[in-house]
Interface confidence: low
């Protein structure tokens, strides 16, 4: 039950995270004009990864896409790439994780296959989240750099020199959405990886069977069977005792005719 809950919760958290990453990528308010030092009160500028917008005091807003790559910082292109990679990986991860969900039955898919798919989707979510966090952080760093550059430029460029002065920009709402969404996707991925360990039967536990043979009292307790999934190890072939209460996610094997060889 715990594994199913962990897997389901991981899926939902990742789904919300990826939706957030998509929203952040599409949002226009990645950076907004710093109103504290705004030389123009009539116009408020803000921009995203794909277009730039101007909102007037009247409420009229007009947005214009970046139709050319010329003049756009290389870092902005890198941020775009990171966000797109994050979305693509996240989308693939979601697709894989749907089929990996324990509550969904697809043919005669074994638990080991579901475990592998859960792990794959988990890793994809982790990488997706990291891509989003990295993209937003690179953009934020670029803004901070430009913020201080602009402040410095205000006091330079005298003596007839041609000087481009940049207005200050500060963090937009999309940055915070991106950070939170990336974090959620990352957490969801970790939860999927944790759920994967519970899905993969590391050892098949047999109930102890007592029987008499030739007048001698023998308690037969088979050693742990190592699953070929590659998760964990049981090198010491330790004895496994029945702990009593078990969850529905644990493998429960009962004695069969093969136990009485």
């Amino acid at each position: 039950m715990a594994v199913t809950a962990c897997q389901g919760l991981g899926f939902v958290v990742s789904l919300i995270g990826i939706a957030g990453i998509i929203a952040a990528t599409c949002m226009d308010q990645w950076s907004t004009q710093d109103l504290y030092n705004n030389p123009v009160t009539a116009v408020f500028n803000y921009q995203g990864l794909w277009r730039s917008c101007v909102r007037e005091s009247s409420g009229f807003t007009e947005c214009r896409g970046y139709f050319t790559l010329l003049g756009l910082p290389a870092m902005l292109q890198a941020v775009r790439a990171l966000m797109i990679v994050g979305i693509v990986l996240g989308a693939i991860g979601l697709l894989v994780s749907i089929f990996a969900l324990k509550c969904i039955r697809i043919g005669s898919m074994e638990d080991s296959a579901k475990a592998n798919m859960t792990l794959t989707s988990g890793i994809m979510f982790i990488v997706s989240g990291l891509c989003a966090i990295a993209g937003v952080s690179v953009f934020a760093n670029m803004l901070v750099t430009n913020f201080w550059m602009s402040t410095a430029n205000m006091y330079t460029g005298m003596g007839g020199m041609v000087q481009t002065v940049q207005t200050r920009y500060t963090f937009g709402a999309a940055l915070f959405v991106g950070w939170v969404a990336g974090g959620l996707t990352l957490i969801g991925g970790v939860m999927m990886c944790i759920a994967c360990r519970g899905l993969a039967p590391e050892e098949t536990n047999y109930k102890a069977v007592s029987y008499h043979a030739s007048g001698h009292s023998v308690a037969y307790k088979p050693g742990g069977f190592k699953a070929s999934t590659g998760f964990g190890s049981n090198t010491k072939n330790k004895k496994i005792y029945d702990g009593g209460a078990r969850t529905e996610d644990e493998v429960q094997s009962y004695p069969s005719k093969h136990d009485y060889v």
Epitope: N45, S52, V54, E62, R64, G71, V165
Partner: nanobody, 114 residues
Framework: EVQLVESGGGLVQPGGSLRLSCAAS????????MGWFRQAPGKGRELVSR???????NYADSVKGRFTISRDNSKNTLYLQMNSLRAEDTAVYYC????????WGQGTLVTVSS
């Protein structure tokens, strides 16, 4: 690299005309917001006129009917035609472009005096 270079400023008598030019490089003037701002001695910077990428134009109330903003896409240049100049129009005029960030030229001085 994005750069803006203004020209056309100078001394002019009240009622006279001037045409300011702003040569842009690093982007196309038709694909972004561009505008003219001015800063009179001891005063803050104010918006004179703005032209959006789509062609929408705005003017400050004080210059409506006297100033005309335009752009030449082939020359990648923004213009400000100033007619019926007054003494209060004396200021440093800045060309500005909003292309992912705000970019400003170095400014050109316009003096209206008799």
């Amino acid at each position: 690299e994005v750069q803006l270079v203004e020209s056309g400023g100078g001394l002019v008598q009240p009622g006279g005309s001037l045409r300011l030019s702003c040569a842009a490089s690093g982007f196309t003037v038709s694909s972004t917001y561009m505008g003219w701002f001015r800063q009179a001695p001891g005063k803050g910077r104010e918006l004179v006129s703005r032209i959006a990428g789509g062609g929408q134009i705005n003017y400050a109330d004080s210059v409506k009917g006297r100033f005309t903003i335009s752009r030449d896409n082939s020359k990648n240049t923004l213009y400000l035609q100033m007619n019926s100049l007054r003494a209060e129009d004396t200021a440093v005029y800045y060309c500005a472009a909003h292309y992912w960030m705000d970019y400003w030229g170095q400014g050109t001085l316009v003096t209206v005096s008799s």
